[in-house]
């Protein structure tokens, strides 16, 4: 394991009043090599709803780096390379679990958190609202 | 907190050989607003690369239910509703963290695991391999 200095301001796991706290082993199963989605496929470039990947970095969170997709266009790319604004590029979102250091900077103490990330984009037919 | 009897077969958090282990407060914090945007879009139906959601259930994992996207077609749906096989519907994958009890039934001990899930589908231009 890694030797971690005890920070006096950090919670003590033996403290009976500490909220429902458990030990979590971070030796992750299934450590897939690539964490950068650009390496695993080039769909972000070849899609009719292409997206850019933005690095969201937070040292107080595990994983500290998360890639967020931002659709490049409002519309979708046609075969000729032009954008069709009768269609919409939209982000596909996924709720994921992360660990956040709490209190901040305490190396050994985290809180489970759910966050919403945009994974990629898809091309959809718009919803047309007809005014009466 | 909840009083939990120590199970003799469960790891001891003070054990120096216990793999990189941290304390985690499991009162899940949800960074999203009260309504859950991950659940509220019907893109899976409106996309040019529509998908079905299949239940992946594992009672020994949190979350116990994860939804896997399976693209409905090999090709992409055109404006007239027909499938264009010159384009490809492909799954967008995301690596997510889940919690697993380890050893099983030890109330205070978990292991973090990475799994790869298909979140939705996008329509891409195929890679054409020209034979010399």
């Amino acid at each position: 394991g890694i030797a971690i200095p005890r920070n006096s301001g950090c919670p003590n796991s033996e403290d009976k009043n500490f909220p429902r706290t458990v030990m979590v082993n971070l030796n992750i199963h299934n450590r897939n090599t690539s964490t950068n989605p650009k390496r695993s496929s080039d769909y972000y470039n070849r899609s009719t709803s292409p997206w850019n990947l933005h690095r969201n970095e937070d040292p107080e969170r595990y994983p500290s780096v998360i890639w967020e997709a931002k659709c490049r266009h409002l519309g979708c790319v046609k075969a000729d390379g032009n954008v069709d604004y009768h269609m919409n590029s939209v982000p596909i979102q996924q709720e994921i679990l992360v660990l956040r250091r709490e209190p901040r900077h305490c190396p050994n103490s985290f809180r489970l958190e759910k966050i919403l990330v945009s994974v990629g984009c898809t091309c959809v037919t718009p919803i047309v609202h007809h005014v009466a | 907190g909840i009083a939990i009897p120590r199970n003799s077969g469960c790891p001891n958090s003070e054990d120096k050989n216990f793999p990189r282990t941290v304390m985690v407060n499991l009162n899940i914090h949800n960074r999203n607003t009260s309504t859950n945007p991950k659940r509220s879009s019907d893109y899976y139906n409106r996309s040019t690369s529509p998908w079905n959601l299949h239940r992946n259930e594992d009672p020994e994992r949190y979350p116990s239910v994860i939804w896997e996207a399976k693209c409905r077609h090999l090709g992409c749906v055109k404006a007239d509703g027909n499938v264009d096989y010159h384009m490809n519907s492909v799954p967008i994958q995301q690596e997510i963290l889940v919690l697993r009890r380890e050893p099983r039934h030890c109330p205070n001990s978990f292991r973090l695991e990475k799994i790869l899930v298909s979140v939705g589908c996008t329509c891409v231009t195929p890679i054409v391999h020209h034979v010399a």
Epitope: L112 | N36, P63, L99
Partner: antibody
């Protein structure tokens, strides 16, 4: 096969509290939540709140916030729902249900709570 | 809260009939809609989850469809054991149920 077995019927006075139990037999709670849903006589179903026994995390419907407490004891695979400051409108059948956070797939048999002076 | 409105509130039908119950959500809920069957004095039973997926052990005469705000439960050929009350329920947000539809013998 998961079975949820609830405690027996209760008769309570207005202003008092009731605590209903729900025991998971044929397996542990696993990682699912346990939700509590009530049904007043001749009425529809109303979700009250839930707990994830693995974590102790609770989520309550706004209507019951401050009046309901949901707990779980993993060592006995039992969840509890305590409702305080009872009034006659709380007369209902109270159900526990296994909650995948998407649907309720296993239900207890129900516990009738009658609030009467 | 998301409001769920079922129609009709009751329906009289005969064995062998095709019965359709509709459920409307006050806002879009994607496909996060479930259908339950409840018989008098019994707990509800999950029939359909995620709008159209049949729960294991449920007869195939039950089917669900819809997305967004409008959903339908169909019983293709009503059987004697199907006379019951049916509830829709959303899980896009904190769960809420429709008011129920009672399927009665004609």
């Amino acid at each position: 096969q998961v079975q949820l077995v609830q405690s027996g019927a209760e008769v309570k006075k207005p202003g008092s509290s009731v605590k209903v139990s729900c025991k998971a037999s044929g397996g542990t709670f696993s990682s699912y939540a346990i939700s509590w849903v009530r049904q007043a006589p001749g009425q529809g179903l109303e979700w009250m709140g839930s707990i994830i026994p693995w974590f102790g995390t609770t989520n309550y419907a706004q209507k019951f916030q401050g009046r309901v407490t949901i707990t779980a004891d993993e060592s006995t695979s039992t969840a509890y729902m305590e409702l305080s400051s009872l009034r006659s409108e709380d007369t209902a059948v109270y159900y526990c249900a296994r909650d995948s956070e998407y649907y309720f797939d296993h239900w207890g048999q129900g516990t009738l709570v009658t609030v009467s002076s | 809260d998301i409001q769920m409105t079922q129609s009709p509130s009751s329906v009289s039908a005969s064995v062998g009939d095709r019965v359709t119950i509709t459920c409307r959500a006050s806002q879009g809920i994607s496909n996060w809609l479930n259908w339950y069957q409840q018989k008098p004095g019994k707990a509800p039973k999950l029939l359909i989850y995620a709008a159209s997926s049949l729960q294991s052990g449920v007869p195939s005469r039950f089917s669900g469809s819809g997305s967004g705000t409008d959903f339908t439960l169909t019983i293709s050929s009503l059987q004697p054991e199907d006379f019951a009350t049916y509830y829709c329920q959303q899980y896009s947000d904190d769960p809420t149920f429709g008011q129920g539809t009672k399927v009665e013998i004609k």
